[in-house]
């Protein structure tokens, strides 16, 4: 769809004649009637299949043609096509004499023909005007034409047809050639995707205007590429959403649950040990002069029992002091004044004279010992049970009673409770020091997750010891959240806290 | 050949709210060319659009009818719903989906057969 | 708000007879504009797309142009599948708007 347009110029008649030589009288009113038709090498009449449009009276004789786009598009003269603009046309342009008011040709004689000129040839959509003039005896014309496309024709041919749009169906301007050129921040064939914030993660983020990154579910931050983990995950991450994988020393499905309670709290004091022992639960050794649970007591010297052949010891601000019994001095009451003949050995000891009687050693008896073999002896001293087994003297030797989940000579072997899969229904095992937890699948509970879980998984009350519970409604599972000393799927187990 | 079918209520009362299926059969909802809307005709009287979206979940309504309504996506299951919320009796229609066409201006070139919804008590 | 308005809301054209059905709307000339033909108890059907784009299937006795203010459909020998409603269609933003329709019938 198109428009032929025709400019007129000037157009010469000096002597104000017809084409039949006849004069016109007083002068030649001059309108012009214009015919533009399909190519023909040689233009003969007959229909104008372009189209025809005619003028008004334009001036007398000899005049010059204003242009006049206002007054009904009169000059340049439009010819509007609507179909493909084939490159090719003829065009006829006659100028004849109106006697009167009446144009319509069958109102004016034969002889009111001035001048006919007939062109024909290529021409290409455009801008630019052609200019031509054509020339007979008595007159002359001037004019210039083009073809232009009509407003949303676009193309060589004006054969294209595109309409600028900014909505959801495209966000563009047309080209010259009636391609879509998107607008900033479009893309797309039909310019109707937004191009989003750069980064934005393909998959978990998406937009619907340009330089926005909207997530999906699941997803966070600024290009929708941190995942969001389970509700309620406390020291745990994810790299999926809704996982919770805990960070290292913290356990429980919500990573609420501390493993390592030393690195975390620091509870041991004045440079001890520290070590865990399971669930919110450690254990410290002392250095030399502490005692405590968290080695927070300075130990008194004289605990350590350094008077020795009965002295009685007294504490001091800058140590001690020992008060010894007769027959006995130095630092710790350490050496005697004692001879063989005082019978200085107790509980059967024999006494051997040293340094020519000035002094004396005693030889014990089996399980007496001290200088003056005054102590039993205790074979518990050197603490030989592991894993906080108990040591019982047993007359010339010791034993050790273990601890639940321990056994051995020295209780340094662990019993594996969960060596016979005590956890029913696929339930993950855990040893702990003083018995086992099974950690259930969804859908199940128990000690030993042999309870199913009903839907409403908390109505039951199924946690102990003032844990919090929690429904997964995504596995109609309760979880319970223990508090501090306790552990299992329902919180029933306490931790053996020193 | 892409086919849509609406499914739903067919009766619903005063202030609830209307959840209409629209699954595509025969072609990729998830697919570029198109957007999937909603229209909606009256007994015996002409076509008003309600809104549509795009496989994305960009959405476009009807401001007249914005406040109450939302259009939603499954990909998964190849099918889009349409929620419209406090419905009231000159709510009652024949309820339409179709397939907009980017490559036709966003011309409608497929439509449900429509459900019919009265709402009444 | 974008209003489209159809005339005449009724026409009775005889068989192999021309029918023009007219759509206007401000500067509906500048917006695509569809057409789309319901016979009573189906589903609408679309006969023209960008304002004058035949889709595959529909005759060419039905033709489209849009420029101006208005939008027309013609329907060049009316023929008895003919008769039904059509509803003209454009895109005012984002917002899907149809005229109020024209009931064409046989004369």
């Known amino acids: 769809s198109g428009v032929f347009q025709l400019q007129l110029q000037e157009f010469i008649n000096e002597r104000g004649v017809l084409a039949s030589g006849r004069p016109c009288e007083p002068g030649c009113r001059t309108f012009f009637r214009v015919c533009l038709k399909h190519f023909q090498a040689v233009v003969s009449p007959g229909p104008c299949t372009f189209g025809t449009v005619s003028t008004p009276v334009l001036g007398t004789n000899s005049f010059a043609v204003r242009d006049d786009s206002s007054g009904g598009g009169r000059n340049p003269l439009q010819l509007p096509f609507n179909f493909t603009w084939p490159g090719t046309f003829s065009l006829i342009i006659e100028a004849w004499h109106a006697p009167g008011d009446d144009l319509r040709p069958e109102a004016l004689p034969p002889d009111a023909l001035i001048s006919k000129i007939a062109i024909q040839g290529s021409l290409a959509v455009g801008q630019n005007w052609l200019l031509d003039e054509q020339t007979s005896t008595l007159t002359r014309l001037r004019y210039s034409y083009r073809v232009i496309c009509s407003d949303n024709y676009y193309g060589d041919n004006c054969s294209r047809l595109c309409k600028k749009r900014n909505d959801h169906f495209g966000h563009y301007v047309c080209q010259p050639d009636g391609n879509l050129s998107c607008l900033p921040g479009w893309t797309g064939e039909y310019c109707q995707q937004p191009i989003c914030l750069s980064g934005c993660h393909e998959q978990n983020g998406y937009c619907s205007k340009p330089a926005e990154c909207l997530c999906r579910p699941g997803w966070q931050g600024r290009l929708c590429n941190e995942c969001i983990p389970h509700n309620g995950c406390r020291h745990g991450t994810c790299s999926t959403p809704w996982q919770c994988t805990c960070d290292e020393g913290w356990g429980g499905l919500f990573c609420d649950q501390d493993l390592n309670y030393c690195t975390h709290h620091s509870p041991c004091k004045n440079g001890a040990t520290c070590s865990n022992s399971g669930q919110r639960s450690y254990t410290c050794t002392c250095r030399p002069g502490y005692t405590g649970v968290d080695c927070e007591l300075e130990l008194s010297e004289c605990d350590s029992n350094p008077c020795r052949n009965g002295g009685s010891c007294k504490d001091q601000e800058d140590g001690y002091h020992c008060l010894c019994p007769p027959g006995y001095y130095g630092l710790h009451c350490e050496h005697s004044t004692l001879s063989c003949a005082d019978s200085p050995c107790f509980n059967g000891g024999s006494c051997r004279e040293r340094n020519q009687g000035a002094n004396y050693a005693c030889e014990c008896p089996p399980n007496f010992t001290g200088s003056n073999c005054e102590k039993k002896v205790d074979r518990c001293t050197s603490n030989p049970c592991a894993n906080g087994g108990q040591c019982l003297n047993r007359g010339p030797s010791r034993m050790c009673r273990c601890r639940p989940g321990f056994t051995g000579t020295y209780c340094e072997l662990h019993v594996s409770d969960c060596a016979r899969n005590p956890c029913a229904h696929g339930g993950t095992c855990h040893d702990l020091e003083n018995g086992l937890m099974c950690t259930c699948p969804a859908g199940f509970s128990g000690r030993r997750c042999e309870v199913r879980t009903s839907i409403d998984a908390c109505a039951s009350s199924p946690c102990f010891n003032r844990a919090t519970c929690y429904t997964d409604l995504s596995t109609d599972t309760f979880v319970c959240n223990c508090p501090y000393g306790f552990v299992g799927s329902r919180c029933e187990f306490p931790v053996g806290l020193p | 050949e892409v086919t849509l079918r609406e499914s739903g209520p067919a009766l619903v009362k005063p202030t609830q709210t209307l959840t209409l299926t629209c699954t595509v059969s025969?072609?990729?909802?998830?697919?570029?060319?198109?957007?999937w809307g909603w229209i909606r005709q009256p007994p015996g009287k002409g076509l008003e659009w309600i809104g549509d979206?795009?496989?994305?979940?960009?959405?476009y309504y009807n401001p007249s009818l914005k406040s109450r309504v939302t259009i939603s996506v499954d990909t998964s299951k190849n099918q889009f719903v349409l929620t419209m919320t406090n419905m009231d009796p000159v709510d009652t229609a024949t309820y339409y989906c179709?397939?907009?066409?980017?490559?036709?201006?966003?011309?409608?070139?497929?439509w449900g057969q429509g459900t019919t919804v009265t709402v009444s008590s | 708000d974008y209003v489209l308005t159809q005339s005449p809301d009724s026409l009775a054209v005889s068989l192999g007879e021309r029918a023009t059905i007219n759509c206007s709307g401000q500067?509906?000339?500048?917006?695509?504009a569809s057409w789309y033909q319901q016979k009573p108890g189906q589903s609408p059907k679309l006969v023209i797309y960008?304002?004058?784009k035949r889709p595959s299937g529909i005759p060419d006795r039905f033709s489209g142009s849009n420029s101006g203010d208005d939008a027309t459909l013609t329907i060049s020998s009316l023929q008895a599948e003919d008769v039904a409603v059509y509803y003209c269609?454009?895109?005012?933003?984002?917002?899907?708007?149809f005229g109020g329709g024209t009931k064409v019938e046989i004369k």
């Open positions: 979206i795009y496989y994305t979940g960009s959405t």
């Open positions: 179709a397939r907009q066409a980017l490559a036709m201006g966003g011309g409608s070139d497929k």
């Open positions: 269609q454009a895109w005012d933003r984002d917002t899907g708007v």
């Open positions: 025969g072609g990729s909802i998830s697919s570029s060319s198109y957007y």
């Open positions: 500067r509906l000339g500048d917006k695509y």
């Open positions: 960008e304002d004058s």
